[in-house]
């Protein structure tokens, strides 16, 4: 039975040209995290594997940095980065947990972070 929950940074906004940290946290389970995939709308951004470490997709190497922790840092943001991001936690023995973050990249300097929320 899957008892865990994924807490994410929720809906967030950031300025064009700036950086943002995408962060998920798995709680309420003793399952072992074997791998975390970071995806953007059917596109692989990065993978963090417990044994192999980080792999950043070649097309994002210049703008994506691993961490902090199992999170992901997006740099040099453009308006095209606006959209949904997913953290997929592969765990043993529970299976897969998925968290969702919506990022809006703003032209203006009025960029506020949304509240944290939980996905069961």
């Amino acid at each position: 039975m899957m008892t865990g929950t994924i807490e994410t940074t929720g809906n967030i906004s950031a300025e064009k040209g700036g950086s943002i940290i995408l962060q998920c946290h798995l709680s309420s389970t003793t399952a072992q995290v074997t791998q975390v995939n970071w995806e953007q709308q059917d596109q692989l951004l990065a993978i963090c594997n417990a044994d192999l470490g980080w792999h950043i997709s070649p097309s994002f190497k210049d703008r994506v940095a691993p961490g902090p922790g199992l999170g992901l840092t997006l740099q040099s943001l453009t308006v095209n980065d606006t959209g949904e991001y997913f953290c997929i936690y592969h765990t043993y023995p529970d299976g897969t947990y998925t968290g969702r973050i919506f990022l809006e990249v703003l032209e203006s300097s009025v960029a506020e972070h949304g509240a944290r929320f939980q996905i069961p």
Epitope: Q35, E39, D42, Q43, L44, I47, D51, H55
Partner: antibody, heavy 118, light 107 residues
Amino acid sequence: EVQLLESGGGLVQPGGSLRLSCAASGFTFDSYSMHWVRQAPGKGLEWVSAISGSGGSTYYADSVKGRFTISRDNSKNTLYLQMNSLRAEDTAVYYCARVPYSVWIDYWGQGTLVTVSS
Amino acid sequence: DIQMTQSPSSLSASVGDRVTITCRASQSISYYLNWYQQKPGKAPKLLIYAASSLQSGVPSRFSGSGSGTDFTLTISSLQPEDFATYYCQQSYSTPLTFGGGTKVEIK
């Protein structure tokens, strides 16, 4: 340099058994899931089996389930495929393959030919 | 099981041509699609992984695109060493499945 070297192929009669081995070098063997993929003469590629880095999880194609057993000895950096109750349709070149992040096959062995015939 | 359908099964092309091979999955596989090149008597070689990522050491004339169910491998300018058979493969779920292959021959 990553190397995967298969051995153990050969001619066997229907109903017989073979054990294939794949000796790995050049990487941290127990960090990677490993797979077997086969290719019948003149045909396409067919996935056969997979095993996690620790050996704790195994997966099989329906066509070999109950007849083939995948295993690994991480102390020897070696992958195995025990093949029992072999059939003519198991005739193929068998490749062992390394699969990082469970997404793609980045290295293949050179293959070993298994021929099942009377 | 997820079925992978490749087209065409074979094609004839000349050096310098732009070549496009398509692969269709029987259900959505997100980006879990890889492309391999195989030459006679040799093991397959990884070209593109995760739909669009170019494997290290592979020439930039190879590119991949698509997500969900429809994927494309493109060779922008065919070179003599590119005449081979190309396979797509899904890693979304087990059993892993391959397309039937596309043989690229010299016109």
